[in-house]
């Protein structure tokens, strides 16, 4: 990659090890934990990021635990199995042979079972609702300014095309960002909504995954937008399969 090729770092993923051993002495970066090569011009997949996060030594971890207000993905952090493309494998198991099925963002979508559990396919999360509550401000933000700023942010910081930002809703102090992306809608080079939402979530928590870039500084017409809580809801193309016992 080229970003910071002089000192050979990965601008889009600080949880990498980089060295100038690529073709023609180019800087090549590999994700911690998996050792997989990553493209530093775009977001690293959530699966590889979770794997890297779990591989970091406990005392050296620069990342903090999710806040009590966050909707924790899949019963908390886990060390996922990723496929050769860096996507979540449909079936995930822990060291005690407890297994479950996940969706494309790595969130559990079935009851837990044993090694005999089958997960036929990786079910795509096609709709993500990011629910934010902002800190009090002098007045409400202008809705169209807020919409434009969030679309710009998702394009420029997370490389997500505005076509995938389906809507931005605002009722002070709640902001809802709807991301939608069917499998067929993704063209070559398009960022996955699940990866963009994960980077955004980590930015909001002050745990930026970007190398050397400042933290997220969200402003709407110069007015700082400070988020005090985030909830993220995931909707899959096929509804999840939980037993009734879990739902009561």
């Amino acid at each position: 990659h080229t970003a910071a090729q002089d000192n050979c770092t990965c601008p889009t993923n600080k949880m990498t090890v980089c060295s100038p051993d690529g073709p023609g002495g180019r800087c090549q970066c590999r994700a911690l934990g998996s050792g997989m090569a990553v493209d530093c011009s775009t977001l690293t997949s959530k699966c590889l990021l979770l794997k890297a996060r779990m591989s970091a030594p406990k005392n050296a971890r620069t990342l903090v635990r999710p806040s009590e207000h966050a909707l924790v993905d899949n019963d908390g952090l886990y060390d996922p199995d990723c496929d050769p493309e860096g996507r979540f494998k449909a079936r995930q198991c822990n060291q005690t042979s407890v297994c479950w099925c996940v969706n494309s963002v790595g969130v559990r979508r079935t009851d837990k079972g044993d090694l005999s559990l089958r997960c036929d396919e990786l079910v795509r999360t096609h709709h993500i609702l990011i629910d934010l509550r902002h800190r009090p401000t002098a007045g409400a933000f202008n809705h169209s300014d807020l919409d434009a700023e969030l679309r710009r942010l998702f394009r420029e910081r997370y490389r997500l095309h505005p076509k995938f930002v389906a809507a931005v809703h605002y009722e002070q102090p709640t902001i809802q960002i709807e991301l939608r992306q069917n499998t067929s809608q993704k063209a070559a080079g398009d960022v996955d909504i699940g990866d963009a939402a994960y980077y955004f979530e980590r930015d909001i928590k002050g745990e930026s995954l970007f190398q050397g870039r400042g933290g997220l500084d969200l402003r709407v017409r110069g007015e700082p937008l400070q988020v005090e809580r985030t909830l993220i809801y995931y909707l899959d193309e096929i509804p999840p399969k939980f037993s009734m016992k879990r739902l009561t």
Epitope: T2, R152, E156, K163, N182, Q185, A187, A188, D190, V191
Partner: antibody, heavy 119, light 108 residues
Framework: QVQLVQSGAEVKKPGASVKVSCKAS????????MHWVRQAPGQGLEWMGE????????SYAQKFKGRVTITRDTSTSTAYMELSSLRSEDTAVYYC????????????WGQGTLVTVSS | DIQMTQSPSSLSASVGDRVTITCRAS??????LNWYQQKPGKAPKLLIY???RLHSGVPSRFSGSGSGTDFTLTISSLQPEDFATYFC??????????FGQGTKLEIK
């Protein structure tokens, strides 16, 4: 190999419309963005708009909104660009170009279609 | 919209020369900068994408560098077929994606 073949040159009167076609081959048409760029005689390149053939999503440069329409026919792997209310300053070579979603680089281009607007 | 400014607008050089063309963006565009070559009567051809990545089939005498707002296209040793017009283009922001005005490279 990737090829984008455009329709032939057109001469139009002011106020008329023109529709230029761009037939893609050598790759999966629905897997890439398609962009339209124009170049007036002796001038630079000007981006007009884009389409994702998979879902027919389009976006246009503000300058052309209301006058340009980009469409596609997935059965023939063809993209179209229609420009209406033509004026003399629309005389240009119009190009279709395949685009990448992240870099927004245009890696393959059609040969160009010269549209001349003259009374 | 992001403005792209190329310099020089024209340049005379000889075969074997090392040539540098610069492109400046009106705001930070990270590394989302592409370079194209265009010959008279022909469509542009992608040379370099994402600042320094060579498109397939492009000779290694072409190279790109830069980050943020300032970018450079370098031809290490000019060949007769390199005399053409070169355009930079940013792919960073929301549409529209904008081009520089072009640099015409002529034989001295």
């Amino acid at each position: 190999q990737v090829q984008l073949v455009q329709s032939g040159a057109e001469v139009k009167k002011p106020g008329a419309s023109v529709k230029v076609s761009c037939k893609a081959s050598g790759y999966t048409f629905t897997s890439y963005w398609m962009h339209w760029v124009r170049q007036a005689p002796g001038q630079g390149l000007e981006w007009m708009g884009e389409i994702t053939p998979s879902d027919n999503y389009t976006s246009y440069a503000q300058k052309f909104k209301g006058r340009v329409t980009i469409t596609r026919d997935t059965s023939t792997s063809t993209a179209y660009m229609e420009l209406s209310s033509l004026r003399s300053e629309d005389t240009a070579v119009y190009y279709c170009a395949r685009g990448h979603g992240n870099y927004v680089s245009f890696d393959y281009w059609g040969q160009g279609t010269l549209v001349t607007v003259s009374s | 919209d992001i403005q792209m400014t190329q310099s020089p607008s024209s340049l005379s050089a000889s075969v074997g020369d090392r040539v540098t063309i610069t492109c400046r963006a009106s705001q930070d565009i990270s590394n989302y900068l592409n370079w194209y070559q265009q010959k008279p009567g022909k469509a542009p051809k992608l040379l370099i994408y994402y600042t320094s990545r060579l498109h397939s089939g492009v000779p290694s005498r072409f190279s790109g560098s830069g980050s943020g707002t300032d970018f450079t296209l370098t031809i290490s040793s000019l060949q007769p077929e390199d005399f053409a017009t070169y355009f930079c283009q940013q792919g960073y922001s929301l549409p529209p994606y904008t081009f520089g005005q072009g640099t015409k490279l002529e034989i001295k």
